[in-house]
Amino acid sequence: NKILVKQSPMLVAYDNAVNLSCKYSYNLFSREFRASLHKGLDSAVEVCVVYGNYSQQLQVYSKTGFNCDGKLGNESVTFYLQNLYVNQTDIYFCKIEVMYPPPYLDNEKSNGTIIHVKGKHLCPSPLFPGPSKP
């Protein structure tokens, strides 16, 4: 049995930040689980991890330098990413593993979410500013 994952097909990060919600066909309440977000078609970069263990506090971290956090719902984990760069525009996949209670479960690979990071464009100064007033 595999857990099904639903993600938005595309998100735009306007202020270099985005919230990506991973919705699962499984209730995570009172489960030991590891939810993660992966970057790239081959999911080679593990962007963020949210680890939950029953009623204990969530452990949230990135080993790859992303500024991330995560919020748990009964059947979802929302990943918060900040300080994204334009060159981090890519496809991102949600992954979920349930370690306890048995049996171990993980997800069917989702369709992923394309996160398009829009750069902050500053208005250029005019080449020839108007005459200054005396």
């Epitope: 204990q56 969530l58 452990q59 949230v60 990135s62 080993k63 500024n67 995560g70 919020k71």
Partner: nanobody, 121 residues
């Protein structure tokens, strides 16, 4: 070099308020869960509160729930603890602590020198 510098402690009457600050440097502050812990005179270390890297989750000890609020400003590399409705039993040295990443809360690798909070009439 990692540094955590607490401030804002002092003498306050029961029912009063204080806001503690912790200025962090020497590490990537937005990448870590941060904690407040305290040590009352003659007692052991007690966990008070924690906040996940971007502030999405906050946790509190039962003894302070509803009275204390943890927050952080990642642009300023600063952790805060707003303490309201203070009681005599809140008297302690308060330390901010940086979590060892990947291990979750209650595991600290650095903490500050502390700031003393005294609640007395």
């Amino acid at each position: 070099e990692v540094q955590l510098l607490e401030s804002g402690g002092g003498l306050v009457q029961p029912g009063g308020s204080l806001r503690l600050s912790c200025a962090a440097s020497g590490f990537t502050f937005p990448g870590y869960t941060m904690e407040w812990v305290r040590q009352a005179p003659g007692k052991g270390l007690e966990w008070v509160s924690s906040i996940t890297p971007l502030g999405a989750n906050t946790y509190y000890a039962d003894s302070v729930k509803g009275r204390f609020t943890i927050s952080r400003d990642n642009s300023r590399n600063t952790l805060y603890l707003q303490m309201n409705s203070l009681r005599a039993e809140d008297t302690a040295v308060y330390y901010c602590a940086k979590d060892i990443r990947y291990t979750g809360t209650y595991n600290f690798d650095y903490w500050g020198q502390g700031t003393l909070v005294t609640v007395s009439s």
